[in-house]
């Protein structure tokens, strides 16, 4: 519960947070758990406590291993864990998983990058943003801050987005570069009137007397996210929950499914061991949502079993 | 500058459910917890609990566990105080608080009314 | 839980006087650890959240003016205005702010003849 994943490169700075907070004025001691043995505070070590934080400067991959930090309160101490791993720099360009952040989606009106971690870090600006392991040129993109703005956000601009800066400590000048995945969504949404594309008007379903039977509602409302949109069956006019019968169950089936960008709703009509006065009810497949509703009505007939005798 | 910015105030009934939010901005979200302390009308201050902004654990005081939770949105730098099944002595302001040695930075405050 | 009792409920000066008031809690306050006295004072006016005037029972926040004084260690304490001044007509509120759960006292009103 008190522990956090925390990962860098060899040779680069890495500053890691103790997963329990406190109030400034407590003291926090770190102890490398393997051994027990105290992180020092001096900051001539090359990997030295300050406080809630812990620095690697630079980090080396035998640093690996995890961490405890104890914050002493008047009350009690609060224990937590850094579990920090060390990897060796990759020759190539190719990022692996275990190096990556949190992925971030951008849209044509909403196109930052934040750098992970970088508050952790005394840098100065500016940040360098490379993508794919190319250095990003071009008026389209702008570093502000501890975050990168893309223009007029395209697909194309999906892929690996790595911030590089520079950790100040105490003069000396350490090198720290974070990747994470970015991912662009389409927001240009729209909702329209219910389209229910099964089943057909006042179509006949035939069944087989004894055996289970399912019919699916499906409807699409729009592209994008909807605010509100729902399908759901009726049995003469009445909700499945208020008709009272056990045999007759809904069950929603993929939920908002997008195919080819519409967003649509499914709701499967399961119907056990299926009898004959079930051949008298009206089952009504409604959609809706904020432009109105729409009803495909079905009804069940028999269907006669295959005659398997000569 | 360091700023706590919360929702407006709200009107319910008994039995509804209300979540309230701070947003926090002008420093690193993750690096103080944040306290909710509630103040009825014409009443003094009591202490909620608060809310560990790095891994997102809740502390709730005793008075407080059940019926309140506390949530988190790091991306937004935004806390939540969600309360369900509403009662009439919920009606009071609702304050986020920045922790620190003593709290230093408090929301304006949220005034949640319950009434049939 | 810790009890903070404060004292006067209420009181009316004149302004320019001097005004003491008075926070004790049912358990000490100091954390031997560091030596701090984990008390806090609050100025709170009306429609406003509280302010922190005192944090670590006598250390000034940044901004508050130097006639707002606290003082005392364990579990008594005070605040102390040199020379009041009418807009600090307000609620004074100590805080327990050493151990859960964090408790206020029940405030004390200062009124401006």
């Known amino acids: 519960k008190f522990s956090k994943q925390s990962w860098g490169l060899e040779n680069e700075a890495l500053i890691v947070r103790c997963p329990r907070q406190g109030k400034p004025s407590y003291t926090v001691d770190w102890y490398y758990s393997q051994t027990n043995k105290s992180i020092p505070t001096q900051e001539r070590n090359r990997v030295f406590a300050s406080g809630q934080l812990l620095k690697f400067l630079p980090a080396a991959v035998a640093d690996s291993g995890i961490y405890t930090c104890i914050v002493r309160s008047p009350t009690f101490n609060r224990t937590g864990y850094a579990n920090v791993t060390i990897y060796k720099k990759q020759s190539d360009c190719n990022v692996p998983d275990y190096l990556m952040y949190s992925t971030v989606s951008g849209s044509e009106k909403n196109s930052k990058i934040y750098c992970p971690t970088i508050d952790l870090y005394n840098w100065t600006a500016p940040l360098e943003w490379f993508k794919n392991c190319q250095a990003l040129q071009g008026s389209r993109y702008r570093a502000h801050k501890s975050f990168l703005v893309i223009d007029n956000v395209m697909t194309e601009d999906a892929g690996d987005y790595t911030c590089k800066f520079i950790h100040n400590e105490n003069g000396a000048n350490y090198s720290v570069t974070a990747t994470r995945s970015f991912t662009v969504k389409d927001e240009q949404g729209f909702s329209l009137f219910p389209v229910i594309g099964a089943p057909a008007q006042n179509e006949i379903k035939e069944v087989e007397i004894g055996k289970n039977a399912n019919l699916t509602c499906s409807a699409c409302f729009g592209k994008g996210t909807q605010f509100l949109a729902a399908v759901l069956w009726q049995l003469n006019g009445t909700k499945i929950t208020d008709f009272g019968e056990p045999r007759i169950q809904q069950e929603e089936g993929q939920n908002q499914s997008f195919s080819n960008g519409l967003a649509c709703l499914d709701m499967v009509l399961r119907i056990a061991d299926v009898k004959e006065e079930d051949l008298l009810l009206q089952y009504d497949c409604l959609a809706l949502n904020l432009h109105g509703l729409r009803r495909h009505t079905v009804r069940l007939s028999r269907k006669n079993p295959i005659d398997h005798h000569s | 500058q360091i700023q706590l910015a919360q929702s407006g105030p709200e009107l319910k009934k008994p039995g509804e459910t209300v979540k309230i939010s701070c947003k926090a901005s002008g420093y690193t979200f993750i690096n103080y917890g944040m306290n909710w302390v509630k103040q009825a009308p014409g009443k003094d201050l009591k202490w909620m609990g608060w809310?560990?902004?790095?891994?997102?654990?809740?502390t709730y005081g005793d008075n407080f566990k059940g019926r309140f939770a506390f949530s988190l949105e790091t991306s937004a730098s935004t806390v939540y105080l969600q309360i369900n099944n509403l009662k009439n002595e919920d009606t009071a302001t609702y304050f986020c608080?920045?922790?620190?040695?003593?709290?230093?930075?408090w929301g304006q405050g949220t005034l949640v009314t319950v009434s049939a | 839980d810790i009890v903070m009792t404060q004292s006067p409920p209420s009181l009316s000066v004149s302004v320019g006087e001097k005004v003491t008031m008075s926070c004790k809690s049912s358990q000490s306050l100091l954390y031997s650890g560091n030596q701090n006295n984990y008390l806090a004072w609050y100025q709170q006016k009306p429609g406003q959240p509280p302010k922190l005037l005192i944090y670590?029972?006598?250390t000034r926040e940044s901004g508050v003016p130097d006639r707002f004084t606290g003082s005392g260690s364990g579990t008594d304490f005070t605040l102390t205005i040199s020379s009041v001044q009418a807009e600090d007509l307000a609620v004074y509120y100590c805080?327990?702010?050493?151990?859960?759960?964090?408790?206020f006292g029940g405030g004390t009103k200062l009124e401006i003849k």
């Open positions: 608080a920045r922790e620190g040695d003593g709290f230093a930075y």
């Open positions: 805080q327990n702010d050493h151990s859960y759960p964090y408790t």
């Open positions: 809310i560990n902004t790095y891994i997102g654990e809740p």
């Open positions: 670590g029972a006598s």
